[in-house]
Interface confidence: low
């Protein structure tokens, strides 16, 4: 049978390297040789390229080499397939070389801010060494912030006579590091170069863009003054690299603005000792380029009643995240402050906090919390300048098996009964929320029994035991990840009771 007709011919001119054409060969049952026939020099000349590979996948491609390729030019390309039964020709295809030229990528050699121009970086590059002198180049520049995965793109063209191989990328975030890549193509071509190697650049610094402010209220001291720990951090969306030289804080009683106190600090928290009345606290951050907008917070009076609106709250782990959800009875509350810190016996030093708006849930990546640590999580409703009563729960981002079992004792040994008591496992050893305890007991040489009780129970009475018999007993504490046994204890039931 005649060979199948070659279809889907496609040609690419790898500029100043080679012109490669490929095609779909069809299902060949016998050895087929292909010849690519070309006319070039605007139809003045012609030549052939013959596939010489014996493997079928390499036989569907053929290349013409320099010096018999110049641009601009028009080509006709036709592929002939030949086997022992005859020859079949493809359709004639027509190509303008400048439409199919593909260059090497450009080389970015510098990405820099331009002095005094905010939110802009200038990209400088070297044109591909091998690019048509007679054609303009078009470019796609893609960029993203270093901690993002999604690219933005801009397209532009450069005149071939343009010595200035630069592009000013504007509308960026201040003091932010960007990753830049560039590709180019001959203006008339449908083939883009590969992307250049990525290069980093940073926009100029600006005045800080703002602060978030929070407080921890402590009980009043003997003299009626109350310690208030002020906490602050860069506003959400502030540049990651934003630098601050210091903070100005001023505060005054709500009833008398004339009693304003001011302080400066370079720390990210401050302990104030305020009177029992309500206060306003304001602050700004500053750097060498200016000041941030003012952040303000109201501190309620000691006797002030705070509103309550959170009715129920729960935490669960889903897809590598700890999710906290709550229900509120106040429809007008749509901002919440979340506080979380490890439940350790000492004073919490590592209080973290974050605000949530327009939602009644909060998520945090599991890996931002320590595994097997219990966290206290509180949610404060916020309405205008008022902060409501918090709702608190405990949760683990990841539970493990307790690192030790309960310390167990045997009491009130009788003829057929005994009381097993155990202590709660220390917080640091629990590794999760204890959901239940299981008591395992077994007479010497006899069958084993077990009984599971909920985590609020710390003792259990065993009944229907055999008299004058040795038993072994063990208590297991379980979290959602599994259980750990305490040490086993031996006891022997009495042979008779005083009541017998």
């Amino acid at each position: 049978a005649l060979p199948a007709k070659p279809e889907n011919i496609s040609c690419v001119y790898y500029y100043r390297k080679n012109l490669t054409c490929t095609w779909s060969p069809g299902k060949e049952t016998s050895y087929t040789q292909y010849t690519v026939k070309r006319t070039y020099a605007f139809g003045e000349k012609h030549d052939n390229c013959t596939t010489n590979s014996s493997t079928s996948e390499n036989r569907a491609s053929c290349s013409f080499f320099l010096p018999r390729i110049t641009i601009p030019d028009n080509y006709t390309i036709e592929v002939e397939a030949e086997n022992g039964d005859g020859v079949i020709k493809s359709h004639m295809t027509y190509w303008r070389l400048e439409n199919i030229a593909k260059t090497e990528p450009p080389k970015i050699f510098r990405v820099k801010p331009v002095l005094g121009i905010k939110r802009m970086i200038q990209i400088e590059w070297i044109k591909p060494e091998l690019a048509p002198v007679s054609s303009d180049l078009k470019y796609t520049l893609r960029f993203r912030t270093v901690n993002s995965t999604s690219w933005m793109e801009v397209n532009f063209a450069k005149n071939r006579k343009d010595k200035n191989q630069t592009y000013n990328l504007t509308g960026l975030q201040p003091f932010t590091e960007y990753v830049i890549a560039l590709r180019c193509a001959v203006k008339e071509s449908k083939f883009w170069s590969d992307w250049s190697q990525e290069k980093m650049g940073m926009t100029e610094e600006e005045a800080p863009c703002g602060l978030e402010l929070w407080r921890v209220l402590k009980p009043a001291e003997a003299d009626g003054r109350r310690p208030v720990r002020l906490l602050w951090k860069k506003a959400r969306g502030a540049p990651v690299l934003e630098k601050t030289l210091g903070y100005n804080i001023w505060y005054y009683p709500e009833s008398n603005t004339n009693l304003t106190e001011t302080m400066n600090t370079t720390n990210q928290q401050l302990e104030l000792h305020l009177g029992g009345e309500s206060f306003w606290v304001s602050m700004i951050s500053y750097n060498s380029l200016g000041k941030s907008p003012v952040a303000t917070l109201r501190i309620p009076a000691i006797q002030e009643k705070s509103f309550q609106c959170i009715e129920v709250m729960q935490a669960c782990v889903a897809e590598d995240q700890l999710v906290v959800k709550w229900q509120s009875s106040a429809l007008d509350v749509n901002t919440w402050m979340i506080e979380w810190f490890p439940d350790v016996d000492s004073e919490p030093t590592t209080l973290s906090w974050e605000s949530v708006s327009q939602a009644t849930n909060w998520t945090i990546q599991q890996d931002k919390l320590k595994p097997f640590w219990c966290y206290n999580i509180s949610v404060y409703p916020m309405l205008h300048d008022k902060v409501g009563e918090p709702y608190s729960i405990q949760a683990y981002a990841k539970e493990g098996v307790p690192s030790e079992g309960p310390e167990t004792k045997v009491e009130n040994i009788g003829v057929k009964t005994v009381t097993i008591t155990w202590k709660e496992i220390p917080k640091s050893e629990r590794k999760g929320i204890i959901c239940n305890y299981t008591i395992f007991y077994q007479a010497e040489g006899g069958k084993g029994f077990s009984k599971t009780v909920n985590s609020s129970i710390l003792q259990y009475g065993l009944e229907s035991l055999k008299r004058k018999t040795s038993y072994i007993v063990q208590v297991m504490a379980s979290t959602s990840a599994g259980g750990t046994n305490g040490t086993s204890i031996n006891f022997k039931t009495l042979s008779f009771s005083v009541f017998e």
Epitope: K107, F109, R110, K112, L115, E124, Q197, M200
Partner: antibody
């Protein structure tokens, strides 16, 4: 710990060529550009050029484009500089130096110990 | 090529003193300037890049300043290990060029 270990001192005859090696360790060799620098008379420093080990792409100071050729061997994390048609003017200490890259190109944050080349008949 | 000029060519100072080296470019190089220290018989060591950023592990007594064409490197409270030669180098494109150096000697 980042280290650039260069080959030892060389005494060569005028008109000959020679190759200096620079073995990198303690970092990802293909992730950083390698610069070559000449120091004459223990004073003047001159940038000869650079090579990107990732793709073998080289950039030369025009002054040295016919004097030096850079190559890399990714498998052994080694950069090489061949000096051609040596004359007494080429007697100097030659350094390889890693480009800091994140600090802006052409900032050399780690240097080899230097290779002393003496051209004499 | 951009020319870098350092002054003075040499200077003497005592331990505990403050010294300043200057470096001038013959055209605007913005903040693209690095400083290196080189001790006798050793390789240069990066001290400062982008005119004022200290390289990793460099003591805080070193500080860089300047932009455009005029730059300086200041060492507060000189230590015995600070004596040697200091070179500036622009990193504003290719080819990067070095200054002629300033030799700091013990008085």
């Amino acid at each position: 710990e980042v280290q650039l270990q260069q080959s030892g001192p060389e005494l060569v005859k005028p008109g000959t060529s020679m190759k200096i090696s620079c073995k990198a360790s303690g970092y990802s060799f293909t992730g950083y550009i390698m610069n070559w620098v000449k120091q004459s008379h223990g004073k003047n420093l001159e940038w000869i050029g650079l090579i990107n080990p990732y793709n073998g792409g080289a950039e030369y100071n025009q002054k040295f484009k016919d004097k030096a050729t850079f190559t890399v061997d990714k498998s052994s994390s080694t950069a090489y500089m061949e000096l051609l048609s040596l004359t007494s003017e080429d007697s100097a200490v030659y350094y390889c130096a890693r480009d800091g890259y994140d600090d802006g190109p052409y900032t050399m944050d780690y240097w080899g110990q230097g290779t002393s080349v003496t051209v004499s008949s | 090529d951009i020319q870098m000029t350092q002054s003075p060519a040499s200077l003497s100072a005592s331990v505990g003193e403050t010294v300043t080296f200057t470096c001038r470019a013959n055209e605007n190089i913005y903040s693209y300037l690095a400083w290196y220290q080189q001790k006798q018989g050793k390789s240069p060591q990066l001290l400062v890049y982008n005119a004022k950023t200290l390289a990793e592990g460099v003591p805080s007594r070193f500080s860089g300043s300047g932009s455009g064409t005029q730059f300086s490197l200041k060492i507060n409270s000189l230590q015995p290990e600070d004596f040697g030669s200091y070179y500036c180098q622009h990193h504003y494109g290719t080819p990067p060029t070095f200054g002629g150096g300033t030799k700091l000697e013990i008085k």
